[in-house]
Amino acid sequence: MAVTACQGLGFVVSLIGIAGIIAATCMDQWSTQDLYNNPVTAVFNYQGLWRSCVRESSGFTECRGYFTLLGLPAMLQAVRALMIVGIVLGAIGLLVSIFALKCIRIGSMEDSAKANMTLTSGIMFIVSGLCAIAGVSVFANMLVTNFWMSTANMYTGMGGMVQTVQTRYTFGAALFVGWVAGGLTLIGGVMMCIACRGLAPEETNYKAVSYHASGHSVAYKPGGFKASTGFGSNTKNKKIYDGGARTEDEVQSYPSKHDYV
C-alpha cells in the first residue's frame, strides 16, 4: 500500500513539476526590467527564452520573437537546450511511469517489469529536474553578470547634460517557476526510485519442497533458489531453479511475493 502511495505521489509531483517546467519555458518573464531606480515606469520591458516584450502604460503590449538563431548568445541557446531536454525527458518519463503505476493493470505485466519501468521513469524525472534547475540557474547567473556590468556602465560617461539610462534586468517570475518546478520533478523522481525498491520482488532464500505421492518421506532440496544480490547476471530478480530430476507427479511451488514459507 505504501509503495503504491509513494509511486502515485511521485507521479503526481513529477507531473506538476514537468507542467511547471513547460510553463516556465514558455513564459516571457525570464528577466524583467529592474525598477529599483524608477519604481513606476511608463514603459516596462521583460524578456523570455523565445521573445522580448514591452508593456506600455497604455496597456499596449508588444512582443518580438528572436527570429535569429546564430545571433543569439550561446548561453541563451544553452538554456533553451537544457529546458527542452528537461521537457522531453520528463514527458518520456511520464509516459513510462503511467504504465509502471501499480494501480494500473496492463495485461500480465510482472512486478519486476513495473519496478524497472518505475526506476527508469524516476531516473528520467531526476535528470529532467536537474536540467531545468541547471537551465534556470545558468540564466540567473547570466542576469547577475549583466546586471552588475550595466550598473557599472550606468555611472560612466555622465559628464554631459544628457543622460542615457541603460535598462537593467532582474529575475523574472519564470525563474522561480523553473526552480520550483525543477525541484518538484527531482523530488518526484526520487520518490519513484524509492517506490521501485518496494516494487521489486523481495529475495528470500526459499527452499524448494519436493512432494512424492508414493513415498512417506519428504525430500528437501536445499539451495533450490539462489539468493540474488542484484548484481551480476541475475539483475532481473528471476528465480533460478535447480535442474534436479523430478517425477511426473512432483508438485512445484512457485513462491510469490505474498507466499510465506
Partner: antibody, heavy 118, light 113 residues
Framework: QVQLVQSGAEVKKPGASVKVSCKAS????????INWVRQATGQGLEWIGE????????YYSEKFRGRVTLTADTSISTAYMELSSLRSEDTAVYYC???????????WDQGTTVTVSS | DIVMTQSPSSLAVSLGEMATINCKSS????????????LTWYQQKPGQPPKLLIY???TRESGVPDRFSGSGSGTDFTLTISSLQAEDVAVYYC?????????FGQGTKLERK
Amino acid sequence: QVQLVQSGAEVKKPGASVKVSCKASGYTFTSYVINWVRQATGQGLEWIGEIHPRGGNTYYSEKFRGRVTLTADTSISTAYMELSSLRSEDTAVYYCARLRRGNAMDYWDQGTTVTVSS
Amino acid sequence: DIVMTQSPSSLAVSLGEMATINCKSSQSLLNSGNQRNYLTWYQQKPGQPPKLLIYWASTRESGVPDRFSGSGSGTDFTLTISSLQAEDVAVYYCQNSYNYPYTFGQGTKLERK
C-alpha cells in the same frame, strides 16, 4: 465614434475643491487609460496624472500628489478628477484624454475651464 | 523628471515652404526593449484641445496628412512639415511618453509668413 465629454465650467474660491467629470463613449471604457492634462491661459500643457479604469491604478505628477484624486466609475464609463486646496494658479483648462499605444493621447475632450478667484 | 526643450519658440514660414521644429530631451527616450523612441507630437489650434500627430517619434497617426513627418532618436527629435498649408498654423508640442511624469515641451508657435 469615440467621444470624451466633460462637465461644465467651474468657478471656485481659493482653498475649495473642484471635481471634474469625463464621460467616455464609443469604446470599451475599461480597455483604455485616462490621462488628465491642464493648460493655463496662454501657457503650455501640464500632465496631472492617469487612471487605469479596470483596476483603478493611479499615477500622479509629483507636483499634484496629495492634492489630486483620480477615480473612475466603470458602470457609467466616467472618470473623475478632484483637485483640492485650490489656489489662483490652478486657474486653467482641464482636459481628459485617452491613452493609446506609444503612450500617446489620441482623443481629447473639449476641456473644462476652472477659475479660482476670491 | 525629463525636461523637454523645443526650438524655436516661434516660427514664421511661407505657405508651401518647409517648416522644421526641434525637440530635445534631457534623457534618452529610446527604449532598448523594442528600439522605439517614446516621443509624441501634438498640434493645438486656438480654442481647441491638442490633436495627436505622431507617436513613437516617427509613426504618423491615422488621418494625419503625410506632409507631417517625425524623425530623430535618443534625445534629439524633429517634426517636419514638408509644405505648409494654411490649416497648419498652430502651436506644436513634443511630449515625453517614456517616463512618469509625462512632460511636454514649452511649445512652438508656427505662423504664416
